[in-house]
Interface confidence: low
């Protein structure tokens, strides 16, 4: 099967001024489709313009497998898919031309990653070791307490990784509550940085020391602070898909399907709000069809479909993956201790895989700089 590499954002090496756009976006469909289809294309373009980031649009257009997944989820007939693609190509050019500093920003965060990765790598390796040690000791936990890697549905990254922040949550706490990062900090389309919230958890037999807990939490929050300071107000320029192509393409595809069905039913589609929705919570058409939430695929599913090593910026996103992912510790009334131990081991392995990807991208960037 032909596939473009995952998360491949093909953006200009410089500002592309070679394509002045004289035609309105809707004109792509003119003369080649029936009027209803043309109107659907316009609706779809409006949706992309207002609700999909430039990065994600480019991903969709530069990655054949992502595009095919989108077309399948949207249930688009071939002629409409072709016309929509042309129109989106046109839209992408316009969006790119609006952001003249894109390339410079990319270089900025690549440089940042090159500088910071060696230290991050060392700390991540340390945390992986700790996770494995904790997994070995998990049998000491009270039978009634397990740790579930329950991910906020709005997160659009791997569903099975207890990352740095996750490692420092409530199982370590003495008092049963801990300030967490806001689950709204997903790496989906919104990627908004908004405050903090708290979470509580019943804790079982205390077998992690307060020192371990404190250490992991502080390290995590320190990293978050670094990244936040570095990115400042421009966070949304960098946090795009960050790995979950599957979720993005299906999510947008289902939104477009809803738009198309609504148009087919001759019902008006609600005007898309200016705020970008989460991919996992697509808008609904007035036809009443609620587009279902996209289920988070497993790590294995994603590793088959999401090829992260192809793109330098992904390295940076994966650092954010490690820093930002918010995992809640959850008290499960059922569940054996052995499952918890296995889960932690799996988490350590997945984190190690992420680190390997980061390391690989670091080498690529290093080689690129040396040339």
């Amino acid at each position: 099967e032909e596939a473009g590499a995952r998360v491949q954002q093909n953006v200009p090496s410089g500002t592309d001024t070679g394509d002045p756009q004289s035609k309105p976006l809707g004109d792509w469909a003119a003369g080649t489709m029936d009027p209803e289809s043309s109107i659907f294309i316009e609706d779809a373009i409006k949706y992309f313009k207002e609700k999909v980031s430039t990065q994600n649009l480019l991903l969709l257009l530069t990655d054949n497998e992502a595009w095919n997944g989108f077309v399948a989820a949207a249930e688009l007939p071939r002629n409409e898919a072709d016309e929509l693609r042309k129109a989106l190509d046109n839209l992408a050019r316009q969006m790119i031309m609006k952001d003249k500093n894109w390339h410079d920003k990319g270089q900025q965060y690549r440089n940042w990653f090159l500088k910071e990765f060696p230290r991050l790598k060392s700390e991540l390796e340390d945390n992986i070791r700790r996770l494995r040690a904790l997994a070995d000791g998990v049998q000491k936990v009270h039978k009634g307490t397990t740790i579930a890697n329950v991910v906020s549905g709005s997160l659009s990254i791997s569903s099975g990784i207890l990352t740095l922040v996750g490692m420092g949550l409530a199982p370590f706490t003495e008092g049963g509550s801990l300030v967490l990062l806001e689950p709204g900090m997903e790496l989906g389309i919104t990627a908004a940085l908004t405050g903090i919230t708290s979470s509580t958890m019943d804790y079982g037999k205390k077998w992690w020391t307060q020192a371990q807990a404190h250490d992991l939490v502080i390290k995590s929050l320190d990293k978050l602070k670094e990244v936040r300071e570095f990115l400042g107000e421009n966070i949304s320029n960098f946090l795009s898909l960050a790995g979950n192509t599957y979720q993005l393409t299906r999510g947008i595809g289902k939104d477009i399907r809803a738009l198309r069905r609504a148009r087919a039913n001759l019902q008006s589609v609600p005007h898309a709000s200016a705020s970008r929705p989460r991919v996992t919570e697509p808008i609904s058409a007035e036809s009443g069809e609620q587009v279902e939430r996209v289920n988070e695929p497993s790590i294995l599913e994603m590793s088959r479909g999401v090829k992260l090593t192809d793109v330098a910026p992904v390295s940076f996103f994966l650092v954010l993956d490690v820093v930002y992912l918010v995992y809640e510790s959850k008290h499960l009334h059922e569940g054996a201790k052995s499952e918890t131990a296995e889960e932690l081991k799996k988490v350590a392995q997945e984190l190690e895989e992420k680190l390997n990807i980061l390391n690989n991208n670091y080498k690529i960037l290093q080689a690129d700089q040396e040339l």
Epitope: N10, V11, D63, R93, A312, I364, D368
Partner: antibody, heavy 119, light 111 residues
């Protein structure tokens, strides 16, 4: 370095696999491409295989060629050669950092292997 | 499908002179363009990528420019050794299918 092998005289319709053996290159870090050149003609891009193993082909090459790789080799399978496939086939490594983000450019090339398709 | 079209061959100029080769993409390739030099019986050599970035070891006499669909390779202070065929290549493999990422080639003759 890159070294292509497997080029030979074949009859039309007989599948042929060309192999590019790499040394000193980590294929998990580089995209690799196949380009061909018919005698006296220009370069013709066939396709690429990314560092992670994803493939992308020229529109005319889809179905006619398959690119795959191991840790030390990159293969190009010509599924059903025709006389038009007679050419020197080059294996090429994308420069470090080449991605969809920056574009794929080939800065290391093999010497090429000649495939002749004739009945 | 994206097609790359180059200046017709041959282009000739005297030693010390300047030659300009144009390359046009059928649609925008967002500055993702490379230039290669190939001499008879040899493998291609990357000169410029990203439309204007000089590959390591390539003399600064070679200059690439352009954006969108129009790109140019300029070789100044021509030397005899510059006699070769030059190819442009789209490094952009998205949005549309690629018929051939390479242009047809332009032969440069140095007098």
């Amino acid at each position: 370095s890159l070294e292509e092998s497997g080029g030979r005289l074949v009859t039309p319709g007989t599948p042929l696999t060309l192999t590019c053996t790499v040394s000193g290159i980590d294929l998990s870090s580089y995209a690799m491409g196949w380009v061909r050149q018919a005698p006296g003609k220009g370069l013709e891009w066939i396709g690429i295989i990314s560092s992670s193993g994803s493939t992308h082909y020229a529109s005319w090459a889809k179905g006619r060629f398959t690119i795959s790789k191991t840790s030390t080799t990159v293969d190009l399978k010509i599924t059903s050669p025709t006389t038009e496939d007679t050419a020197t086939y080059f294996c090429a490594r994308a420069r470090a950092g080449s991605t969809y983000y920056t574009g794929y450019y080939f800065n290391l090339w093999g010497q090429g292997t000649l495939v002749t398709v004739s009945s | 499908a994206i097609e790359m079209t180059q200046t017709a061959s041959p282009v000739s100029a005297a030693v010390g002179g300047t030659v300009t080769i144009n390359c046009q993409a059928s649609e925008s390739i967002y500055s993702n363009l490379a230039w290669y030099q190939q001499k008879p019986g040899q493998r291609p050599k990357l000169l410029i990528y990203g439309a204007s970035t000089l590959e390591s070891g390539v003399p600064s006499r070679f200059k690439g420019s352009g954006s969108g669909t129009e790109y140019t390779l300029t070789i100044s202070d021509l030397e005899c050794d510059d006699a070769a065929t030059y190819y442009c290549q789209s490094g952009y493999y998205g949005i549309s299918a690629i018929n051939n990422a390479f242009g047809g080639g332009t032969e440069v003759v140095v007098k």
